[in-house]
Amino acid sequence: VPLSRTVRCTCISISNQPVNPRSLEKLEIIPASQFCPRVEIIATMKKKGEKRCLNPESKAIKNLLKAVSKERSKRSP
């Protein structure tokens, strides 16, 4: 079976809840691909070590992405 026919998405549930950027250890944005037909956002939480799936369409999550990219652009020279 060609790999392109093997759907392997990471997220089967998605959270709409706001996430405090300070509580994030890592934020991964996985673009849609031949393996998974949709964008997936995975937040690794500092305290719990939990990898949580976030809803890319949620207003709260879009705001989180803006806040994180703003923070990153501040840090980069």
Epitope: I12, S13, S15, I42, K48, G49, C53, N55
Partner: antibody, heavy 120, light 108 residues
Framework: QVQLVQFGGGVVQPGRSLRLSCAAS????????MHWVRQAPGKGLEWVAV????????YYADSVKGRFTISRENAKNSVYLQMDSLRVGDTAVYYC?????????????WGQGTMVTVSS | SSELTQDPAVSVALGQTVRITCQGD??????ASWYQQKPGQAPVLAIY???NRPSGIPDRFSGSSSGNTASLTITGAQAEDEADYYC???????????FGGGTKLTVL
């Protein structure tokens, strides 16, 4: 509070079909993946199938692939398990469960279970 | 699909500490979750992720993992902890879920 109420089940002959349903309440159903898990009498838990929050992705245990179909209707806050070509070995209590947000897909809340008996 | 292996039965004296283990290759990639099941009842989530307890689960329950082994520890076991305990994780293939065979805990 989160509630998963199951319907269906009963006694059915080998080769016949049965449809289980699970009505969810107390949470945003359209954000959660859902599992079906079964337990044969006196045995352990066996995962059966999972469906993603939007119904676009479905995975099945090898033991039921091609015979069982998982589906959902987000407008009705319901998930279903269509069981065709039933075998004696499918006799079990079937549980509907919600999948947590984490990438390990752990079931967090469970329905009360419904008994399916396949017997001639 | 990969397997999770548990000891079929474990016993503990009332008030003592007991550890229930779960082994499997998938635990190198995914955290285990732990479920408590009492006779005639649906399973209840006891521990998930790194070491997270849902509300209502007493703090005597804790989880840990190392390599391909996950553990559920009950510190100061109570009579009401007597039950079957199942571990669970996402399969290493990524598109299945697997349960351990279960451990029957007896509190003496």
């Amino acid at each position: 509070q989160v509630q998963l109420v199951q319907f269906g089940g009963g006694v059915v002959q080998p080769g016949r079909s049965l449809r289980l349903s699970c009505a969810a309440s107390g949470f945003t159903f359209s954000s959660y993946g859902m599992h079906w898990v079964r337990q044969a009498p006196g045995k352990g838990l066996e995962w059966v199938a999972v469906i993603s929050y939007d119904g676009s992705i479905k995975y099945y245990a090898d033991s039921v692939k091609g015979r069982f179909t998982i589906s959902r209707e987000n407008a009705k806050n319901s998930v279903y398990l269509q069981m065709d070509s039933l075998r004696v070995g499918d006799t079990a209590v079937y549980y509907c469960t919600r999948a947590g947000y984490s990438t390990d897909w752990h079931p967090d809340y469970w329905g009360q279970g419904t008994m399916v008996t396949v017997s001639s | 699909s990969s397997e999770l292996t548990q000891d079929p039965a474990v016993s503990v004296a009332l008030g003592q500490t007991v550890r229930i283990t779960c082994q499997g290759d998938s635990l190198r990639s995914y955290y285990a979750s732990w479920y408590q099941q009492k006779p005639g009842q649906a399973p209840v989530l006891a521990i998930y992720g790194k070491n997270n307890r849902p509300s209502g689960i007493p703090d005597r329950f804790s989880g840990s993992s190392s390599g391909n082994t996950a553990s559920l520890t009950i510190t100061g076991a109570q009579a009401e902890d007597e039950a079957d305990y199942y571990c669970n994780s996402r399969d290493s293939s990524g598109n299945h879920v697997v349960f351990g065979g279960g451990t029957k805990l007896t509190v003496l």
